[in-house]
Structures are given as C-alpha cells and as structure tokens.
C-alpha cells in the first residue's frame, strides 16, 4: 500500500524553473513527507534549507520549486522520504548543471550483484585540464589532460553492493557545481534472485520492472502495473494502480520518475533522454524507450503501451491466444463500516480476468500491517477473500485498504472502519 514517487523535473538545470515533487499515492503517510539534501551521497553540497511546500494539485504530495535565478545553487543529491508504521521509504535523485563539462549516460543505473558494469560520462566541453572521477565525493581517479576521452568510463567487473553510490566526473579546476552525476544501484542479490539469502527466484518482471531483493515484488516502471508489470496504464498515468496523472500538455514529457531502490529513475513509458523530453523512435516503447516491439500478426506498436493486441490475443508480443485480460475491480465494499469491539471478519470481493487468487488479495490496516485471507473462495465471476481479526479495538479505527494485485493490473479500495 506504500507507493512513494519522486518526480524530478528537470534533472539538468539550465536557466528555467526546476522542481522536485514527492507523491504518496494511494496511502496516507503517518508523518509528513520530507524532501531534503542527500548528504550521504554528496557531502559538500549547498547547506541552504529547502523551501518545501504542499503540492496543491494532489492530496499527499510535497514540492520544491527553484526559480530560474536560483539555478546555480541546485546542483547536488536529494531525497524524498515517507513513513508508515515506523518504516521509512527513501527515494534518491540528483540535479546537475546542463552546462556541466561532462554529462552522464543515465541518471541512475540498476544492476545485479556480480554484473559487469560500465558507467559512462560524455565529454561536452573540451578543456586543457585533468579530468577527475569521484564516488560519493571520494576521489577515484584522474585522467591526464591530454588523455581525456570523449566518453569517460568507469568499469566495474563483478559489481558488489559496496560499489553502489553517486559517481561524478568533472575537470580538476571545476567543483561540485560543474560535476556530472550518475547513481549506481547494485541489487543485493544476483540476477533474478531475492530474499535474505538470495535463494528465491524472482517473478519475471516485464516492461523493465525491477525485482525487489527483499520482497521479490516487481517495482513497475511509470506507465505499467500489476504483479508482473505486464499491464499498461491508461495514457499519461502512473503509480502502482495508475491513479496518478501527468498534468503536462504532452503528458509525462519532461518528468523524470524516481522510485524506491532498486528501481532508481527513468522516464515514463514513451519518453527517453536525460530530460525525458524525447519521444521513442518507431518500434520502441516503455521507460527510456528501452523496449522493442516485436508484435505478432502485424499488430500495431504504441510507444506508450507496446503491442496493441487484437481481441482474443494477449502477451507482450500478442503471442498468446486467450480471453483478454481484465484489470481487477473491487466490488460490494461499503465506504464506511461500523463494528463493535471483538472478532471481525471483513470481506474483499473482486472481479477481473484471470480471477484474483488467494495470494493476490490483501487487506491493509491503518497502521500499515498487511493481512492475508483466512478463507478464500471464487465463483465464475468473483473472488472472495475473508479475513479474520480476532480482536478489533477502537484504536483500529481508520482507513483500511482492500488491495488486489494480479497480472492484469492492480486496484486498491480504501474504506473506513469505526470500532465502538
């Protein structure tokens, strides 16, 4: 139920207005969302406090806006944090000068433990100075002035979690404010593995979703949802249940989305580039346009959704025959329930295709505790999950959430419980 999203618009700072927006989508944080400077990633950045305001367009969102005259003070690393049930979710991002001497290939890069990694910086200004590379503000290497290549590369064979961090490049005569940054995220586990011992196999996350090493869940890119991120959202929407909407004239253009690690940052589906302001080339789709359409039967490729399958066909390439998937819907759930203290058996009922299974239906208490069904049954059209609370008490009053997450998508429905 915890869906925290940080929108960095625009990470390359010129003389235009730039902002960070942190959204708690579909849940109410127990403490206010915070946006701050990430001194763990970069120590020597500006100390000035940030002017954090409420984003009036959304219920639970905070925003920092820098006017064009403040551009010189923006460079650095930032975080957004939300808390629920004592658990903190922190999302990190960076901003840098568009006029920096080097520019990163990507804002963040997520790799698996043991991967062979290349972190690249493109030289955009030629200077008669040594180039220097840092990690988290710590010096790594200098490249003599006459040997600075067009692409400055850091190569990490067999990447380890301790290699994670913010890598930066600049000329020695420069400083933090002329540096280019890229953040390397190294999953604690090897490819396709998760769990404390990394011995569980990840669900195949589609559309560039990333398997969380602690939970095994797919973190879906902006524009996709569901247990395996197979389901495309409606146009210009994002979030775990696709409830949030990009308000720009061209949808999510110029929105860099940052999600909790190990996802990092990417453009919304349909966009690419460091500023997420370049449309995908024909035949490509998805976050950063990294996915290639290979649609069967000559089906159309949409840059936002991928292959648009004819009725009766499904799958990323429209390769499977079958009934078209239907996003789950929660039905027959009142907005408000009054109960007496004692035993309580709330029911969540959902439709959709395929029908939600026992594991795909959960109930989230106001304190963030996730409950799994005690009983479960289904008819031709509905799945019914019955939960058991042995002793419900007045402090349990508040907003409870019925949550359904299947391959066909995700839906959450909040409802109020008053306990007498």
């Amino acid at each position: 139920a915890m869906d925290l999203i940080l929108i960095n618009s625009l990470p390359l700072v010129s003389d235009a207005e730039t902002s960070l927006t942190c959204i708690a989508s579909g849940w109410r944080p127990h403490e206010p969302i915070t946006i701050g400077r990430d001194f763990e990633a970069l120590m020597n950045q500006h100390q000035d406090p940030l002017e954090v305001t409420q984003d009036v367009t959304r219920e639970w969102a905070k925003k920092v806006v820098w006017k064009r005259e403040k551009a010189s003070k923006i460079n650095g690393a930032y975080f957004c944090e939300g808390r629920v049930r004592g658990e903190a979710i922190r999302i990190r991002t960076m901003k840098m000068r568009q006029q920096a001497s080097f520019l990163p290939a990507t804002l963040t890069m997520t790799v698996d433990k043991g991967d062979n990694v290349n972190i690249s910086f493109k030289k955009v200004l030629i200077k008669e100075e040594d180039a220097v590379i840092y990690k988290n503000g710590s010096f790594i290497h200098s490249v003599p002035r006459h040997e600075v290549p067009d692409i400055l590369e850091v190569h990490l064979p067999h990447a380890q979690p301790q290699d994670a961090g913010v890598y930066s490049a600049r000329y020695i005569g420069g400083n933090l404010f002329t540096s280019a940054f890229t953040r390397l995220i190294v999953r604690r586990c090897e490819a396709q593995k998760w769990g404390p011992e990394c011995n569980h196999l990840c669900t195949a996350c589609m559309n560039n979703g990333v398997c969380h090493e602690d939970t095994g869940e797919c973190i879906c890119p902006p524009g996709f949802m569901g247990r395996t991120c197979e389901k495309a959202c409606e146009l210009h929407t994002f979030g775990r249940t696709c409830k949030e909407r990009c308000s720009g004239q061209e949808g999510c253009k110029s929105y860099v989305f940052c999600l909790p690690d190990p996802y990092g940052c990417s453009c919304a589906t349909g966009w690419k580039g460091l500023q997420c302001n370049e449309a995908c080339h024909p035949g490509f789709y998805g976050p950063d346009c990294k996915l290639r359409c290979s649609c069967n039967n000559g089906e159309m490729c949409d840059r936002f959704q991928g292959c648009l399958c004819s009725p009766g066909w499904q799958g990323l390439q429209c390769e499977r025959e079958g009934i078209q998937r239907m996003t789950p819907k929660i039905v027959d759930l009142p907005d408000h329930i009054e109960v007496n203290s004692g035993k309580f058996n709330p029911i969540c009922k959902a439709s959709g295709w395929p029908l939600p299974t026992n594991e795909e239906m959960t109930l989230v208490k106001p304190d963030g505790t996730v409950l799994h069904p005690k009983d479960f049954n289904h008819t031709d059209h509905f799945s019914v999950a019955i939960f058991t609370i042995h002793r419900i008490l007045p402090p349990d009053s508040g907003v409870w959430v019925c949550s359904v997450n299947t391959v066909a998508g995700m839906v959450e429905k909040p409802f109020n419980i008053s306990v007498k």
Epitope: D130, F139, S142, E147, V154, L156, P157
Partner: antibody, heavy 124, light 107 residues
Framework: EVQLVESGGGLVQPGGSLRLSCAAS????????IHWVRQAPGKGLEWVAA????????YYADSVKGRFTISADTSKNTAYLQMNSLRAEDTAVYYC?????????????????WGQGTLVTVSS | DIQMTQSPSSLSASVGDRVTITCRAS??????VAWYQQKPGKAPKLLIY???FLYSGVPSRFSGSGSGTDFTLTISSLQPEDFATYYC?????????FGQGTKVEIK
Amino acid sequence: EVQLVESGGGLVQPGGSLRLSCAASGFTFSSYWIHWVRQAPGKGLEWVAAISPNDGSTYYADSVKGRFTISADTSKNTAYLQMNSLRAEDTAVYYCARSRYYGQRLVYYVMDYWGQGTLVTVSS
Amino acid sequence: DIQMTQSPSSLSASVGDRVTITCRASQDVSTAVAWYQQKPGKAPKLLIYSASFLYSGVPSRFSGSGSGTDFTLTISSLQPEDFATYYCQQSYTTPPTFGQGTKVEIK
C-alpha cells in the same frame, strides 16, 4: 576473509633474478588491482608496480621499468613480480597490496589490504 | 613525479594528546590523499582515503582534511596502540608517491 600472502623472497647476488608471488584469497581477484610496494630497511614506502588481473593493464615506477615485470594468473588468483638485473638498492621488504578496479585506464591507488611482506636482499 | 613532504618527521606525545601531522604535495592533487599507519615489522594499514574519508573499522579519533596541496591527519586523543609511523600517499596519478613518514613516539 581477505588475505594476501607473499613468497619468493631471499638472498640474491647483484645482477641476479628473483620471482615473487602474491597469493590472493577471500575476494574476487579480477575486481582489484594488485600492487607491489617496497620498503628498504629503516626507510619509507615506495610503490613499484601494479597490474589489473581483469585486463592485464600494467604500470611501473621509473626505477624498475625494464627490469621488473608484473603478471597475474587469474586461474590461481596469484600475482607475480619477476625481478631481473637486481641491484643493491632493490634490497627491501616487498609487500603486495590490492585496490578496487574501476577500469583499464582508471588505476586506483588507495590500497586497502596488504600482505605481511617478503624480504629481498641483494648482496654479494 | 609528485613529491609528498610530511612534517614533522617524528614527534613525542602522551596518551590523550591531540596529534596533528601535515603533508604537502608538490602540485594540486585534488582530494586524492590517503593515510596509512605502520607498526614495526608489520604491513601498513589504511586509515583515511580521499583526504577525509575514514576507512571502515578505523576508530573515529582519526580524521583527515585538506584538498589541493595541503593535507592533515589528526588523532584527537592518542591511545597506546596509536604509537606507530604514519605515511601520507597521493593517489592522484602514476606513480603514486608516499611521504617520508612521521614517527609518533611515547613521551
């Protein structure tokens, strides 16, 4: 546990040769540079050479260039220092040390683990 | 080659004293300076890297500062196990070079 163990030191006559070995364990050999650093009796530290087992890149101090050759065998997780045309001034304790590999041309000189050293004495 | 000049070459101090060792580079080395501790008959141990970053497992009484050409290692409260020789080293360029060492002795 990270370990670097040097061997092969001893007494050799001027003009002679010696081959030092550095056996590495407890870490991914190809993800690090291996360095040789020496220390003459009662003196300070002097860097000698470095190799990346990952790509075979090598660097040498001017004082040993052309006489010493650093190499590595990734199948044995071992680095070597072949020392030819030895001189009296090469007498020292030779340490092997490691540093994180960040790329072929990005030699990183912060050495976080060191072996216990092996003594090389060049004397007639 | 870049020269690293350490001062003093030796010093006497008591347990609990604050000790400062300085190191000067012959040219700008950014923050590419490491500090090592060496005890007689033992291998050097890394204390500080990148001028001010404390290496893992090193007590917080050790700290480093500086950038460009001037660098400092400080031991805030000298402990019996800190009596040793300390070396600075530039990791900016090939060849890496060490200072001549500072021997910290018991007063």
